[in-house]
Every structure is written in structure tokens, then in C-alpha cells.
Interface confidence: low
């Protein structure tokens, strides 16, 4: 079976102040099984923004359908942006277990949120 | 204005190392991930490796993957490539790009160097 | 790895002509592709990024069209200086990244 790669082709993305970002995720294998999660910086300070399996998470909404069994789109809608959002946001694919373990991550994408224009 | 200066090539039997040099102006050299591209003769351009510009990431494309090294010295805003175990498929002129620091396309090159394994 | 493949291989046109230029990827790179123009004994030039955003300092009779796995570069009035080889390069899924086989673009 193919290696899971996890592609954020961007490195950084750009966003004014109220509008809506979008960060893009895919993956290259189905394989291991478990959940795709987002997160907002690294380390023990990282704040989760979006995981597969709980929710609501009112602001984000998914791509494409996550739900169906062969989705390898885990890109994410973040709708108005604040300064607060800045940072950067990785892609981490868990593998499914008593509790999920973190697999592999993206490279990370940078969120800059410009000042919402006059 | 964006400089890109690759030296280091040359004509070498196959087996043989070679260590090419890409010495960069004009940008901010540790923020920027550094790429080698190649072109054989008469061919098309062809993505040998990448490393981020914290020196802590590396990629390698298949063909050169456990005998190439690309490696970087920030303080001298310098990029290299180790070549070793050459072999006649390596001959190409060999190109330092720059990524855009937004995008993962090249945004400047290098004029090239010369790599030529011949026995 | 995501396979571009451009076509046709060699296109032979006059000056003033319109010149189109095809690239097809093997799976979508949604709008993550860019076009580089490369002459004799010079390295590649970029063109276009993002599929339809035009480098700095090049012509507007350059464009580029298409997002997933469809692409197109359009000169629309060659001129002396376009005559060359072109190349896209996909940098959606990486590594590697990968270069299409090129379109060379010759005075008929």
C-alpha cells in the first residue's frame, strides 16, 4: 500500500478581516484508518479547530464530503476571519484507536489576516 | 535584484563525486526554500531535490534518492549539492531555483552548471 | 506523483499567430500549476503562476486558463522573442515536484 503523504500545498495564505479562508488539505492513501484533524500552531499550546468525528465547529465547514469513505479532501472553509485566526494550521491525519494517535502531519500553512478594508 | 550563481560542474567518470555550489544575492536567503532542477541534453527539466530554508526539511526525487545530499549554509547564503556514485543518467546542466515564499513554484534561477559523467 | 503531459509536442506558427498551448494533469492540482518559457542556452523563465496570474513583467499576450487537470497557456500574437520551449510544472502534490515534457513553439 502507498505511503500516506499529507500535501498543504500552500505555505501561506493571506485573508482580510471577515472574509472566509480556505486551507487545503489532501492525502495520498486511505490507509491507516482514523480521523483527520486541524490545528491551529504546534506543541501542547496547539488549539484544534476541526477534527473529523466531534463537532459542531460553527465556523469551519469541510470541502468536500468527508463523510464518504473514499475522501482524501480535508480542506477547510474558516468563515470570518478575525486577527485571532492568525497562524499556522496543520492537517494531521490520527490513527484510529483507545485513544486516537496522532500518524503524520502537513507542513503546516500560515493564515495572515489582513485589515478589512475601508 | 535576485542573483542565483551555481558553480562546481564539470566532467567526472562515472562513480565519481562532485559537490556543486549555488551562491545567492538579493532575498532573504534563510527564509526561502531552495530547490536543484536538471536538464539533460536535448530533454525536458527535471525536480531533483528541495530543502526548506531552515536546512531542517529534505526532499529527493527517486533517481538520485541515497546519492545526492543537498544541504545549505545560511550564514553564507550558499546552497549545495554532494553528488555521489555518478552515473552517465546524471549529466545535465544543473539549475538552482528559488521557491516563491507563498507558493512552491520557482520564482528565480540560476544560470546553470555543466555536469558531465563520461568514462 | 501527479504526470503532466503537454501537447502538441511541436507547434510551428508564423508571427502574429495565436499560439495554444495544452497541459493535462494526471489527477487535479486544482489552480496549482505554473508555465515557464525557456530558450536556447537560458534557464526557464517563469510565466505564469496559479494558472492564470502572470509573473511580473511579462506580456499580457500571455495567458493561462484551466484549474484541475486541464490547462492552457494562449499567446495571442506571437513575436519574435516567444519563440521557445514551454513547460508547466504542477506544485500541488509534493513532493515530487513534477515538470510537463514541454511544448516547443517553432517559426513556421
Known amino acids: 500500500e502507498e505511503e500516506l503523504q499529507i500535501i498543504q500545498p500552500d505555505k501561506s495564505v493571506s485573508v482580510a478581516a471577515g472574509e472566509s479562508a480556505i486551507l487545503h488539505c489532501t492525502i495520498t492513501s486511505l490507509f491507516p484508518v482514523g480521523p483527520i484533524q486541524w490545528f491551529r500552531g504546534a506543541g501542547p499550546a496547539r488549539v484544534l479547530i476541526y477534527n473529523q468525528r466531534q463537532g459542531p465547529f460553527p465556523r469551519v465547514t469541510t470541502v468536500s464530503e468527508t463523510t464518504k469513505r473514499e475522501n482524501m479532501d480535508f480542506s477547510i472553509s474558516i468563515s470570518n476571519i478575525t486577527p485571532a485566526d492568525a497562524g499556522t494550521y496543520y492537517c494531521i491525519k490520527f490513527r484510529k484507536g483507545s485513544p486516537d494517535t496522532e500518524f503524520k502531519s502537513g507542513a503546516g500553512t500560515e493564515l495572515s489576516v489582513r485589515a478589512k478594508p475601508s | 535584484d535576485v542573483q542565483l550563481v551555481e558553480s562546481g560542474g564539470g566532467v567526472v567518470r562515472p562513480g565519481e563525486s562532485l559537490r556543486l555550489s549555488c551562491a545567492a544575492s538579493g532575498f532573504t536567503f534563510s527564509s526561502s526554500d531552495m530547490n536543484w532542477v536538471r536538464q539533460a541534453p536535448g530533454e525536458g527539466l527535471e525536480w531533483v531535490s528541495l530543502?526548506?530554508?531552515?536546512?531542517?526539511?529534505?526532499y529527493y526525487a527517486d533517481s538520485v534518492k541515497g546519492r545526492f545530499t543537498i544541504s545549505r549554509d545560511n550564514s553564507k547564503n550558499t546552497l549545495y549539492l554532494q553528488m555521489n556514485s555518478l552515473r552517465a543518467e546524471d549529466t545535465a546542466i544543473y539549475y538552482c531555483a528559488k521557491e516563491n515564499n507563498m507558493y512552491r513554484f520557482f520564482d528565480y534561477w540560476g544560470l546553470g552548471t555543466l555536469v558531465t559523467v563520461s568514462s | 506523483e501527479t504526470v503532466l503531459t503537454q501537447s502538441p509536442g511541436t507547434l510551428s506558427l508564423s508571427p502574429g499567430e495565436r499560439a495554444t498551448l495544452s497541459c493535462r494533469a494526471s489527477?487535479?492540482?486544482?489552480?496549482?500549476l505554473a508555465w515557464y518559457q525557456q530558450k536556447p542556452g537560458q534557464p526557464p523563465r517563469l510565466l505564469i503562476h496559479?494558472?492564470?496570474n502572470r509573473a511580473a513583467g511579462i506580456p499580457d499576450r500571455f495567458s493561462g486558463s484551466g484549474s484541475g487537470t486541464e490547462f492552457t497557456l494562449t499567446i495571442s500574437s506571437l513575436q519574435s522573442e516567444d519563440f521557445a520551449v514551454y513547460y508547466c510544472?504542477?506544485?500541488?502534490?509534493?513532493?515530487?515536484?513534477?515538470f510537463g515534457g514541454g511544448t516547443k513553439v517553432e517559426i513556421k
Open positions: 496559479a494558472a492564470r
Open positions: 510544472q504542477q506544485y500541488y502534490d509534493r513532493p515530487p515536484l513534477t
Open positions: 489527477q487535479s492540482v486544482y489552480t496549482y
Open positions: 530543502i526548506s530554508g531552515s536546512g531542517e526539511i529534505t
